[in-house]
Protein backbone atom coordinates (compact mmCIF):
# COMPACT_ATOMS: atom_id res chain seq x y z
CA UNK A 1 0.00 0.00 0.00
CA UNK A 2 1.59 3.49 -1.09
CA UNK A 3 2.66 5.85 1.74
CA UNK A 4 -0.19 9.12 2.15
CA UNK A 5 2.57 10.83 3.43
CA UNK A 6 3.22 14.04 1.23
CA UNK A 7 5.90 13.81 -1.14
CA UNK A 8 8.14 16.42 -2.59
CA UNK A 9 10.43 15.40 -5.84
CA UNK A 10 13.24 17.09 -5.71
CA UNK A 11 16.64 15.37 -6.42
CA UNK A 12 18.92 15.63 -3.69
CA UNK A 13 22.09 18.03 -4.96
CA UNK A 14 19.95 18.73 -8.11
CA UNK A 15 20.74 21.73 -9.76
CA UNK A 16 19.86 23.88 -13.16
CA UNK A 17 22.42 25.59 -15.38
CA UNK A 18 20.34 28.55 -16.95
CA UNK A 19 20.56 32.34 -18.15
CA UNK A 20 19.92 35.69 -17.08
CA UNK A 21 17.56 37.40 -19.48
CA UNK A 22 15.61 33.95 -20.36
CA UNK A 23 12.12 33.03 -18.48
CA UNK A 24 12.22 29.76 -16.30
CA UNK A 25 9.81 27.80 -14.35
CA UNK A 26 11.23 25.77 -11.10
CA UNK A 27 8.99 23.21 -10.37
CA UNK A 28 8.91 21.55 -7.17
CA UNK A 29 6.50 18.22 -7.64
CA UNK A 30 4.46 17.19 -5.00
CA UNK A 31 2.46 14.03 -4.12
CA UNK A 32 -0.63 13.61 -2.08
CA UNK A 33 -3.61 11.63 -1.55
CA UNK A 34 -7.01 14.06 -0.88
CA UNK A 35 -6.51 17.46 0.09
CA UNK A 36 -3.30 19.26 -1.87
CA UNK A 37 -1.32 20.86 0.91
CA UNK A 38 0.08 24.53 1.26
CA UNK A 39 3.36 24.73 -0.36
CA UNK A 40 5.85 27.31 -0.09
CA UNK A 41 9.41 28.24 -2.08
CA UNK A 42 12.50 29.69 0.08
CA UNK A 43 15.37 30.78 -0.98
CA UNK A 44 18.87 29.29 1.10
CA UNK A 45 20.88 32.01 3.04
CA UNK A 46 23.68 30.15 4.64
CA UNK A 47 22.07 27.72 6.60
CA UNK A 48 18.39 29.61 6.45
CA UNK A 49 16.12 29.41 4.01
CA UNK A 50 14.59 32.99 3.38
CA UNK A 51 10.58 32.28 2.52
CA UNK A 52 9.56 34.24 -0.95
CA UNK A 53 7.03 36.43 -0.51
CA UNK A 54 4.97 37.99 -3.18
CA UNK A 55 6.81 35.95 -6.40
CA UNK A 56 4.63 34.85 -9.07
CA UNK A 57 3.89 31.10 -8.47
CA UNK A 58 1.47 28.30 -9.86
CA UNK A 59 0.38 24.78 -9.52
CA UNK A 60 -0.15 22.42 -12.56
CA UNK A 61 -1.48 19.22 -12.66
CA UNK A 62 -0.69 15.84 -14.10
CA UNK A 63 -1.59 12.20 -14.00
CA UNK A 64 -0.41 11.02 -10.65
CA UNK A 65 1.35 14.59 -9.59
CA UNK A 66 0.83 18.21 -9.52
CA UNK A 67 3.75 20.40 -9.47
CA UNK A 68 4.29 24.31 -7.59
CA UNK A 69 6.00 26.31 -10.09
CA UNK A 70 8.09 29.12 -9.04
CA UNK A 71 8.29 31.92 -12.37
CA UNK A 72 11.54 33.44 -12.73
CA UNK A 73 10.51 36.01 -15.91
CA UNK A 74 12.75 36.63 -16.40
CA UNK A 75 16.22 35.29 -14.52
CA UNK A 76 18.07 37.82 -12.95
CA UNK A 77 21.90 37.38 -11.82
CA UNK A 78 20.55 37.32 -8.30
CA UNK A 79 18.64 34.20 -8.96
CA UNK A 80 21.40 32.42 -8.90
CA UNK A 81 21.33 29.83 -5.68
CA UNK A 82 19.65 27.72 -3.85
CA UNK A 83 16.10 26.93 -3.68
CA UNK A 84 13.72 24.85 -1.55
CA UNK A 85 10.26 23.88 -1.40
CA UNK A 86 7.81 22.92 1.74
CA UNK A 87 4.85 21.65 1.98
CA UNK A 88 2.40 22.60 5.17
CA UNK A 89 0.31 19.06 5.77
CA UNK A 90 -1.41 17.97 8.52
CA UNK A 91 0.60 20.59 10.75
CA UNK A 92 3.80 19.39 9.86
CA UNK A 93 6.44 20.76 7.53
CA UNK A 94 7.50 18.78 4.76
CA UNK A 95 10.78 20.21 3.55
CA UNK A 96 12.61 19.54 -0.23
CA UNK A 97 15.88 18.40 -0.63
CA UNK A 98 17.21 21.91 -2.25
CA UNK A 99 18.26 22.43 -5.76
CA UNK A 100 20.58 24.96 -7.17
CA UNK A 101 20.24 27.79 -9.84
CA UNK A 102 23.43 28.52 -11.57
CA UNK A 103 22.83 31.44 -13.10
CA UNK A 104 25.35 33.01 -15.82
CA UNK A 105 24.88 36.71 -17.26
CA UNK A 106 24.95 36.18 -21.15
CA UNK A 107 26.45 39.69 -21.26
CA UNK A 108 29.74 38.22 -19.36
CA UNK A 109 29.96 35.19 -21.79
CA UNK A 110 30.85 35.46 -25.48
CA UNK A 111 28.66 32.40 -26.39
CA UNK A 112 26.56 30.43 -24.43
CA UNK A 113 28.85 27.62 -22.33
CA UNK A 114 27.42 23.76 -21.98
CA UNK A 115 25.89 22.57 -18.88
CA UNK A 116 28.55 20.79 -17.69
CA UNK A 117 31.06 23.85 -18.23
CA UNK A 118 28.45 25.95 -16.03
CA UNK A 119 28.40 23.10 -13.13
CA UNK A 120 32.60 22.51 -13.38
CA UNK A 121 33.09 25.97 -13.93
CA UNK A 122 32.20 28.22 -10.81
CA UNK A 123 34.11 31.23 -11.74
CA UNK A 124 31.03 31.61 -14.35
CA UNK A 125 28.80 31.97 -11.74
CA UNK A 126 27.39 34.38 -9.22
CA UNK A 127 27.39 33.99 -5.91
CA UNK B 1 11.84 -6.96 -11.96
CA UNK B 2 14.84 -4.59 -11.42
CA UNK B 3 17.41 -5.09 -13.71
CA UNK B 4 21.10 -3.03 -15.17
CA UNK B 5 21.89 -4.87 -18.51
CA UNK B 6 25.83 -3.63 -19.50
CA UNK B 7 27.44 -4.15 -22.86
CA UNK B 8 29.51 -6.51 -23.22
CA UNK B 9 33.91 -6.71 -22.78
CA UNK B 10 36.03 -4.51 -24.89
CA UNK B 11 39.23 -4.70 -26.09
CA UNK B 12 40.35 -1.49 -26.76
CA UNK B 13 44.38 -0.27 -28.22
CA UNK B 14 45.78 3.25 -26.09
CA UNK B 15 44.24 6.74 -27.37
CA UNK B 16 40.95 5.06 -28.73
CA UNK B 17 37.78 5.65 -26.59
CA UNK B 18 35.42 2.89 -25.27
CA UNK B 19 31.54 3.80 -25.01
CA UNK B 20 29.54 1.24 -22.39
CA UNK B 21 25.81 1.10 -22.35
CA UNK B 22 23.44 0.36 -19.78
CA UNK B 23 20.00 -0.73 -20.12
CA UNK B 24 18.02 -0.31 -16.97
CA UNK B 25 13.91 -2.09 -16.81
CA UNK B 26 11.99 -2.13 -13.38
CA UNK B 27 12.09 1.19 -12.24
CA UNK B 28 11.76 5.21 -13.86
CA UNK B 29 15.58 6.17 -14.70
CA UNK B 30 13.98 9.86 -14.19
CA UNK B 31 13.88 9.26 -10.56
CA UNK B 32 17.35 8.27 -10.74
CA UNK B 33 20.86 9.18 -10.80
CA UNK B 34 23.28 6.87 -12.87
CA UNK B 35 26.33 7.04 -11.18
CA UNK B 36 29.55 4.74 -13.15
CA UNK B 37 32.13 3.04 -10.89
CA UNK B 38 35.17 1.44 -11.95
CA UNK B 39 37.35 -1.21 -10.34
CA UNK B 40 41.21 -1.91 -12.08
CA UNK B 41 41.56 -5.92 -11.29
CA UNK B 42 42.35 -6.77 -7.23
CA UNK B 43 41.59 -2.86 -6.81
CA UNK B 44 38.81 -1.27 -5.04
CA UNK B 45 36.18 0.74 -6.55
CA UNK B 46 36.83 4.23 -8.05
CA UNK B 47 33.67 6.64 -8.16
CA UNK B 48 33.88 8.07 -12.31
CA UNK B 49 30.85 10.87 -11.87
CA UNK B 50 26.93 10.46 -12.00
CA UNK B 51 24.49 11.33 -14.73
CA UNK B 52 20.78 12.48 -14.06
CA UNK B 53 18.54 10.96 -16.90
CA UNK B 54 16.54 13.70 -16.13
CA UNK B 55 17.77 16.72 -17.39
CA UNK B 56 21.50 15.64 -18.74
CA UNK B 57 23.22 16.99 -16.04
CA UNK B 58 26.47 15.32 -15.43
CA UNK B 59 28.86 15.46 -11.91
CA UNK B 60 32.26 13.80 -12.93
CA UNK B 61 35.38 13.32 -10.91
CA UNK B 62 38.01 15.66 -11.27
CA UNK B 63 40.47 12.88 -12.51
CA UNK B 64 37.38 11.76 -15.59
CA UNK B 65 36.89 16.00 -16.80
CA UNK B 66 37.64 16.17 -20.15
CA UNK B 67 37.75 12.50 -20.66
CA UNK B 68 34.69 11.05 -19.75
CA UNK B 69 31.24 11.85 -21.39
CA UNK B 70 27.70 10.83 -19.56
CA UNK B 71 24.35 10.51 -21.19
CA UNK B 72 20.96 9.31 -21.25
CA UNK B 73 18.40 7.90 -23.65
CA UNK B 74 15.10 8.12 -21.55
CA UNK B 75 12.76 6.81 -24.57
CA UNK B 76 14.99 3.49 -24.46
CA UNK B 77 15.75 3.49 -20.38
CA UNK B 78 19.85 3.33 -21.31
CA UNK B 79 22.66 5.00 -19.72
CA UNK B 80 25.96 5.44 -21.29
CA UNK B 81 29.73 5.70 -20.34
CA UNK B 82 32.21 7.70 -22.79
CA UNK B 83 35.73 7.42 -21.75
CA UNK B 84 38.86 8.38 -24.40
CA UNK B 85 42.15 8.98 -24.70
CA UNK B 86 42.01 5.25 -22.95
CA UNK B 87 45.48 4.26 -21.50
CA UNK B 88 46.77 0.78 -19.87
CA UNK B 89 45.79 2.31 -16.24
CA UNK B 90 41.74 2.57 -17.23
CA UNK B 91 41.97 -1.69 -17.95
CA UNK B 92 38.76 -2.67 -15.38
CA UNK B 93 35.65 -3.23 -14.74
CA UNK B 94 33.07 -0.37 -15.28
CA UNK B 95 29.63 -0.20 -13.31
CA UNK B 96 26.80 1.59 -14.10
CA UNK B 97 24.93 2.25 -10.23
CA UNK B 98 21.14 3.24 -10.40
CA UNK B 99 20.65 5.54 -7.03
CA UNK B 100 16.73 6.59 -6.24
CA UNK B 101 17.65 10.83 -6.43
CA UNK B 102 14.76 11.70 -4.22
CA UNK B 103 14.77 9.38 -0.38
CA UNK B 104 17.76 6.86 -1.34
CA UNK B 105 15.05 4.22 -1.43
CA UNK B 106 16.73 2.01 -3.68
CA UNK B 107 20.41 1.25 -4.54
CA UNK B 108 20.75 -1.07 -7.87
CA UNK B 109 24.33 -1.98 -9.68
CA UNK B 110 24.61 -3.51 -12.88
CA UNK B 111 27.25 -6.70 -13.79
CA UNK B 112 29.90 -4.78 -14.66
CA UNK B 113 31.76 -4.40 -18.51
CA UNK B 114 35.10 -5.71 -18.54
CA UNK B 115 37.31 -3.31 -20.45
CA UNK B 116 40.72 -3.87 -21.48
CA UNK B 117 42.88 -1.21 -22.85
CA UNK B 118 46.35 -2.88 -24.73
CA UNK B 119 48.21 -2.13 -27.40
CA UNK C 1 38.35 14.94 -1.57
CA UNK C 2 36.91 13.50 1.63
CA UNK C 3 39.29 10.33 2.56
CA UNK C 4 37.28 6.95 3.47
CA UNK C 5 39.31 4.46 6.15
CA UNK C 6 38.56 1.10 6.69
CA UNK C 7 39.81 -1.04 9.56
CA UNK C 8 40.44 -3.48 9.70
CA UNK C 9 41.53 -3.89 5.45
CA UNK C 10 40.78 -7.86 6.12
CA UNK C 11 39.60 -10.01 8.87
CA UNK C 12 39.46 -14.05 9.54
CA UNK C 13 36.66 -15.02 11.55
CA UNK C 14 34.26 -18.17 12.11
CA UNK C 15 30.55 -18.70 11.29
CA UNK C 16 28.49 -17.71 13.99
CA UNK C 17 30.95 -14.87 15.29
CA UNK C 18 29.99 -11.16 15.50
CA UNK C 19 32.23 -8.58 13.19
CA UNK C 20 32.13 -5.17 13.37
CA UNK C 21 34.02 -3.20 10.27
CA UNK C 22 34.92 0.71 10.77
CA UNK C 23 34.69 3.47 8.40
CA UNK C 24 36.41 7.02 8.98
CA UNK C 25 35.58 9.86 6.88
CA UNK C 26 38.49 12.48 6.58
CA UNK C 27 35.35 15.50 7.52
CA UNK C 28 31.83 15.22 8.35
CA UNK C 29 29.29 13.33 6.19
CA UNK C 30 26.82 15.44 7.82
CA UNK C 31 24.72 17.46 4.52
CA UNK C 32 22.69 20.25 5.27
CA UNK C 33 19.60 18.44 5.40
CA UNK C 34 21.02 16.92 8.89
CA UNK C 35 21.81 13.39 7.32
CA UNK C 36 24.63 11.27 7.16
CA UNK C 37 25.15 9.70 3.07
CA UNK C 38 26.91 6.69 3.44
CA UNK C 39 26.31 3.41 2.19
CA UNK C 40 27.80 -0.02 2.86
CA UNK C 41 28.05 -2.44 -0.18
CA UNK C 42 29.15 -5.71 -0.07
CA UNK C 43 30.99 -7.56 -2.79
CA UNK C 44 32.12 -11.20 -3.55
CA UNK C 45 34.19 -12.45 -6.05
CA UNK C 46 33.28 -11.77 -9.71
CA UNK C 47 30.25 -9.86 -8.86
CA UNK C 48 28.52 -6.80 -8.92
CA UNK C 49 28.89 -4.60 -5.44
CA UNK C 50 25.10 -4.70 -4.00
CA UNK C 51 24.07 -2.18 -1.32
CA UNK C 52 23.71 -3.55 2.04
CA UNK C 53 23.03 -0.84 3.66
CA UNK C 54 22.31 3.61 2.88
CA UNK C 55 21.90 6.63 5.07
CA UNK C 56 23.68 4.71 7.82
CA UNK C 57 21.75 2.46 9.06
CA UNK C 58 18.47 1.79 6.98
CA UNK C 59 18.66 -1.70 5.55
CA UNK C 60 18.17 -2.42 1.62
CA UNK C 61 14.43 -4.52 1.03
CA UNK C 62 15.56 -8.02 1.47
CA UNK C 63 19.14 -7.65 3.62
CA UNK C 64 19.03 -9.69 6.86
CA UNK C 65 18.40 -8.36 10.07
CA UNK C 66 22.01 -9.59 11.34
CA UNK C 67 23.82 -6.70 9.22
CA UNK C 68 23.31 -3.36 10.90
CA UNK C 69 24.86 -0.03 10.43
CA UNK C 70 25.76 2.92 12.57
CA UNK C 71 27.55 5.98 13.64
CA UNK C 72 27.29 9.88 12.78
CA UNK C 73 29.66 12.73 11.44
CA UNK C 74 33.07 11.07 10.23
CA UNK C 75 32.65 7.44 12.57
CA UNK C 76 30.30 4.48 10.97
CA UNK C 77 30.23 1.21 11.69
CA UNK C 78 28.97 -2.04 9.72
CA UNK C 79 27.80 -5.07 12.00
CA UNK C 80 27.57 -8.43 11.12
CA UNK C 81 25.60 -9.69 14.56
CA UNK C 82 26.45 -13.55 13.67
CA UNK C 83 27.83 -14.61 10.51
CA UNK C 84 27.16 -16.99 8.17
CA UNK C 85 29.03 -18.31 5.23
CA UNK C 86 27.24 -16.07 2.77
CA UNK C 87 28.93 -13.19 4.28
CA UNK C 88 32.18 -13.79 3.49
CA UNK C 89 32.76 -11.24 1.00
CA UNK C 90 34.57 -7.63 0.86
CA UNK C 91 32.98 -4.89 2.30
CA UNK C 92 33.47 -0.88 1.27
CA UNK C 93 31.83 2.29 2.11
CA UNK C 94 30.99 4.80 0.29
CA UNK C 95 30.08 8.23 0.66
CA UNK C 96 27.95 10.34 -1.16
CA UNK C 97 27.68 13.74 0.82
CA UNK C 98 30.26 15.76 -0.54
CA UNK C 99 31.69 15.76 -4.33
CA UNK C 100 34.16 13.70 -5.72
CA UNK C 101 32.02 10.09 -3.62
CA UNK C 102 34.79 8.22 -2.68
CA UNK C 103 35.07 4.81 -1.12
CA UNK C 104 37.17 2.73 1.47
CA UNK C 105 39.90 0.57 0.34
CA UNK C 106 37.66 -2.14 1.27
CA UNK C 107 37.11 -5.21 4.19
CA UNK C 108 38.29 -8.19 2.98
CA UNK C 109 35.89 -10.83 4.95
CA UNK C 110 37.53 -14.01 5.27
CA UNK C 111 36.90 -17.96 6.91
CA UNK C 112 38.85 -18.38 9.75
Known amino acids: KESCDVQLYIKRQSYHSIFAGDPFKLECPVKYCAHRPQVTWCKLNGTTCVKLEGRHTSWKQEKNLSFFILHFEPVLPSDNGSYRCSANFLSAIIESHSTTLYVTDVKSASERPSKDEMASRPWLLYS | QVQLVQSGAEVKKPGASVKVSCKTSGFNIKDTYIHWVRQAPGQGLEWIGRNDPANGNTKYAQKFQGRVTMTADTSTSTVYMELSSLRSEDTAVYYC????????????WGQGTLVTVSS | DIQMTQSPSSLSASVGDRVTITCRSS???????????LNWLQQKPGKAPKRLIY???KLDSGVPSRFSGSGSGTDFTLTISSLQPEDFATYYC?????????FGQGTKLEIK
Open chain 3, 27 to 37: QSLLDRDGKSY
Open chain 3, 94 to 102: WQDTHFPYT
Open chain 3, 55 to 57: LVS
Open chain 2, 97 to 108: ASYEGYYERFGY
